[in-house]
C-alpha cells in the first residue's frame, strides 16, 4: 500500500514533519506529541506587531 504524503507544503511552508496527522511536532523537544500536549509556547495572537513564529507544525491531509 502506498503511503500518501504526510503534509502538503505551501511555497513558504515549513519542511514536513515526521508526525502522523493525529499528532503535532514539538520544536522544543524535537519529537511528535499529541497536539494538546505540546510544551512549545503557543504562537502569538493574530494582529501582533511581528509575525508569530511557527512553533508547532501540524501536517494536513
Amino acid at each position: 500500500m502506498r503511503r500518501g504524503p504526510r503534509s502538503l507544503r505551501g511555497r513558504d511552508a515549513p519542511a514536513p514533519t515526521p508526525c502522523v496527522p493525529a499528532e503535532c511536532f514539538d520544536l522544543l523537544v524535537r519529537h511528535c506529541v499529541a497536539c494538546g500536549a505540546l510544551r512549545t509556547p503557543r504562537p502569538k495572537p493574530a494582529g501582533a506587531s511581528s509575525p508569530a513564529p511557527r512553533t508547532a507544525l501540524q501536517p494536513q491531509e
Partner: antibody, heavy 118, light 113 residues
Framework: EVKLVESGGGLVQPGGSLRLSCAIS????????MSWVRQPPGKALEWLGF??????????EYNPSVKGRFTISRDNSQSIFYLQMNTLRAEDSATYYC?????????WGQGTTVTVSA | DIVMSQSPSSLAVSVGEKVTMSCKSS????????????LAWYQQKPGQSPKLLIY???TRESGVPDRFTGSGSGTDFTLTISSVKAEDLAVYYC?????????FGGGTKLEIK
C-alpha cells in the same frame, strides 16, 4: 488491504503475565504508529498506549492506568508488535484490540480475549 | 484525563429516520494553530471490532457513507445519521486524541425498531 490479527489471549491467574501479538500485513510496518485498546465485556473502550514509527524512534506513550505493568514493543522484521502484560488483575479481563494510528485509530484487528481469574 | 460524555446511552429508531447523538468533552479539543478538533467517531457493530467513521470531528473516513456526518467544535460534538439503515445497528463511540491518555465516551447504542 490493511490487516491486523491479534493472538495470545487466554485464561491467566491473577498476578500472572501474558504477551499479546498483533500480526500486520498490507502496509509498511515501520512507517506507522501502532496502538492497543481494550474493551471489558459489555463496557466501553480504553486506550492503553501506542508505539510510534521508525521516524520517531519507536517511542511509546501509555495510559497511566497501565503504565509500569504493560509494555508495547515491535518486531519489524516479522511485522508483529506486542503487548506485554504483567501483574494481571481481574479488572484486566477484556477483549484486546490492536489498531493502526494515523488520523485517529484508523484500522482495527478483530481482537483477542484475555480472562484473568483464579 | 479528559472525560468524554455521550448521550443518550441508547436510542431506538425506525429505518429512514434521522438520528443525532451527542458527545461532550471536559475540555476543549480544538487546537488553535490549525483549527482542528481532535475528536473521532467509531462504529462498533455487534460482535465486531470498532471502525473509524469520522476524524478531526467532521472529516468522513474513506468509504464511509455520506449519511454519516460529524459536527461540532471545542467541547460539544454531534454525530448525525441522516437516514438510518438496518445495518447501522451498532454502538457509536467518540474519542479524543487531543492529549494523553486518549479517552473514549461510554458509547451510544443505536437500536432499530
Amino acid at each position: 488491504e490493511v490487516k491486523l490479527v491479534e493472538s495470545g489471549g487466554g485464561l491467566v491467574q491473577p498476578g500472572g503475565s501474558l504477551r499479546l501479538s498483533c500480526a500486520i500485513s498490507g502496509f509498511t510496518v515501520t512507517a506507522y504508529y501502532m496502538s492497543w485498546v481494550r474493551q471489558p465485556p459489555g463496557k466501553a473502550l480504553e486506550w492503553l498506549g501506542f508505539i510510534r514509527d521508525k521516524a520517531n524512534g519507536y517511542t511509546t506513550e501509555y495510559n497511566p492506568s497501565v503504565k509500569g505493568r504493560f509494555t508495547i514493543s515491535r518486531d519489524n522484521s516479522q511485522s508483529i508488535f506486542y503487548l506485554q502484560m504483567n501483574t494481571l488483575r481481574a479488572e484486566d479481563s477484556a477483549t484486546y484490540y490492536c489498531a493502526q494510528v494515523r488520523r485517529a485509530l484508523d484500522y482495527w484487528g478483530q481482537g483477542t480475549t484475555v480472562t484473568v481469574s483464579a | 484525563d479528559i472525560v468524554m460524555s455521550q448521550s443518550p446511552s441508547s436510542l431506538a429508531v425506525s429505518v429512514g429516520e434521522k438520528v443525532t447523538m451527542s458527545c461532550k468533552s471536559s475540555q476543549s479539543l480544538l487546537y488553535s494553530s490549525n483549527q482542528n478538533n481532535y475528536l473521532a467517531w467509531y462504529q462498533q457493530k455487534p460482535g465486531q471490532s470498532p471502525k473509524l467513521l469520522i476524524y478531526w470531528a467532521s472529516t468522513r473516513e474513506s468509504g464511509v457513507p455520506d449519511r454519516f456526518t460529524g459536527s461540532g467544535s471545542g467541547t460539544d460534538f454531534t454525530l448525525t445519521i441522516s437516514s438510518v439503515k438496518a445495518e447501522d445497528l451498532a454502538v457509536y463511540y467518540c474519542q479524543q486524541y487531543y492529549t494523553y491518555p486518549y479517552t473514549f465516551g461510554g458509547g451510544t447504542k443505536l437500536e432499530i425498531k
